[in-house]
């Protein structure tokens, strides 16, 4: 039950995270005009990964796409790549994890297969989250560098007669969305990896076999090292064996150490 909950929660958290990464990637407010200590401009500038926008005080907003590929800064291209890789990995991870969910039965898929799929999706979510966090952090670092450069210019470039309004950019809402979303995807991935441990059978490729002893009955379960003898311990008529060999799937399972997370 705990494994299912952990897996389900990991899936939901990752889903929210990836939705956030997609939202952040599409958002226009990666960098916004710094209004602190600036004259009250009747124009507000903000930029995204794909276009830059200007919101006039009149209420009209005009956005222009970056229609060049070669003319863009390498850092911006790198951020775009990281975010897209994060989205693609996250989307594949979501697809894989849907089939890996314990609460969903697909044919006669074994727990070992579900465990492997859960681990795969978990790793994908972790990498996806790291890509998003890295992308947002690279962009943030770029902003900080440019901010201090333009601040220096504001105080050194005042030699001329004509003053110029120095537009400085600060962190936009998309950066915070990206950081949170990346973190959620990462947490979701870790939860999936933890759930995977609980899904994996402790011993595979062995059958649980009941052996008939002539004097008294002993039910031997490989791996568990638990034997129940017939000497008075079955006073309440508990069924220890029914004469045949059963697989681990068919036998009522004992709580394993991985069930409590």
């Amino acid at each position: 039950m705990a494994v299912t909950a952990c897996q389900g929660l990991g899936f939901v958290v990752s889903l929210i995270g990836i939705a956030g990464i997609i939202a952040a990637t599409c958002m226009d407010q990666w960098s916004t005009q710094d209004l602190y200590n600036n004259p009250v401009t009747a124009v507000f500038n903000y930029q995204g990964l794909w276009r830059s926008c200007v919101r006039e005080s009149s209420g009209f907003t005009e956005c222009r796409g970056y229609f060049t590929l070669l003319g863009l800064p390498a850092m911006l291209q790198a951020v775009r790549a990281l975010m897209i890789v994060g989205i693609v990995l996250g989307a594949i991870g979501l697809l894989v994890s849907i089939f890996a969910l314990k609460c969903i039965r697909i044919g006669s898929m074994e727990d070992s297969a579900k465990a492997n799929m859960t681990l795969t999706s978990g790793i994908m979510f972790i990498v996806s989250g790291l890509c998003a966090i890295a992308g947002v952090s690279v962009f943030a670092n770029m902003l900080v560098t440019n901010f201090w450069m333009s601040t220096a210019n504001m105080y050194t470039g005042m030699g001329g007669m004509v003053q110029t309004v120095q537009t400085r950019y600060t962190f936009g809402a998309a950066l915070f969305v990206g950081w949170v979303a990346g973190g959620l995807t990462l947490i979701g991935g870790v939860m999936m990896c933890i759930a995977c441990r609980g899904l994996a059978p402790e011993e595979t490729n062995y059958k649980a076999v009941s052996y008939h002893a002539s004097g008294h009955s002993v039910a031997y379960k490989p791996g568990g090292f638990k034997a129940s003898t017939g000497f008075g311990s079955n006073t309440k008529n508990k069924k220890i064996y029914d004469g045949g060999a059963r697989t681990e799937d068919e036998v009522q399972s004992y709580p394993s150490k991985h069930d409590y997370v």
Epitope: Q33, P39, T41, A42, V43, S57, G59, T164, V165, T167
Partner: antibody, heavy 118, light 113 residues
Framework: DVQLVESGGGLVQPGGSRKLSCAAS????????MHWVRQAPEKGLEWVAY????????YYADTVKGRFTISRDNPKNTLFLQMTSLRSEDTAMYFC???????????WGQGTLVTVSA | DIVMTQSPSSLTVTTGEKVSMSCKSS????????????LTWYQQKPGQPPKLLIY???TRESGVPDRFTGSGSGTDFTLTISSVQAEDLAVYYC?????????FGAGTKLELK
């Protein structure tokens, strides 16, 4: 057709108060920022105040800050300018204007004359 | 505050003549975000409210005759009337639309010779 009609002007004593109104029609008033601009007799244009479509932010010229208050009633399609502590230099024709692309004023009212005199 | 300086203060012209007037701002009105200069030109005839002619320094408002042309960027701007008509006799104002307060120039009066 866009129409802006100012009212409320007249003769006021120095230190007195007056409230100007601007009735808008022919456009979605609640979607546009609005301004008050004044023009002293035989003088140039002077920007007075701005109010955004949602009533925030609001900006004033330094010459009227603390004395004039701009407001709007979107359901009634009306812009207001409450003027207090009036001085003789506030004597002017007061125009309301609609904010447009390029932060320009595309439509102006005919104006209402405010005369501050003893 | 941004100071807008218009020159000349008055111009005497004959109909059909080409005329230019200047407007200079104390600070750049150029916005890098959209590569536009936030300067507007208005025409005001006696007893009338101002009329919008040009915004973004060079974009003509709809309905404005194409003999009116705005040019310039940053701090130096020009309004040109390619062939002055009798109905163009008015006062022309430039306005800073970039930084509050949105200041106006003192105006250039166009008069008939």
């Amino acid at each position: 057709d866009v129409q802006l009609v100012e009212s409320g002007g007249g003769l006021v004593q120095p230190g007195g108060s007056r409230k100007l109104s601007c009735a808008a029609s022919g456009f979605t008033f609640s979607s546009f920022g609005m301004h008050w601009v004044r023009q002293a007799p035989e003088k140039g244009l002077e920007w007075v105040a701005y109010i955004s479509s949602g009533s925030s932010p609001i900006y004033y010229a330094d010459t009227v800050k603390g004395r004039f208050t701009i407001s709007r009633d979107n359901p009634k399609n009306t812009l207001f300018l409450q003027m207090t502590s009036l001085r003789s230099e506030d004597t002017a024709m007061y125009f309301c204007a609609r904010f447009y692309y390029g932060n320009s004023f595309d439509h102006w009212g005919q104006g209402t004359l405010v005369t501050v005199s003893a | 505050d941004i100071v807008m300086t218009q020159s000349p203060s008055s111009l005497t012209v004959t109909t059909g003549e080409k005329v230019s007037m200047s407007c200079k701002s104390s600070q750049s009105l150029f916005n890098r975000g959209n590569q536009k200069s936030y300067l507007t030109w208005y025409q005001q005839k006696p007893g009338q409210p101002p009329k919008l002619l040009i915004y973004w320094a060079s974009t003509r408002e709809s309905g404005v005759p194409d003999r009116f042309t705005g040019s310039g960027s940053g701090t130096d701007f020009t309004l040109t009337i390619s062939s002055v008509q009798a109905e163009d006799l008015a006062v022309y104002y430039c306005q800073n639309n970039y930084i509050y307060p949105l200041t106006f120039g003192a105006g250039t009066k166009l008069e008939l010779k």
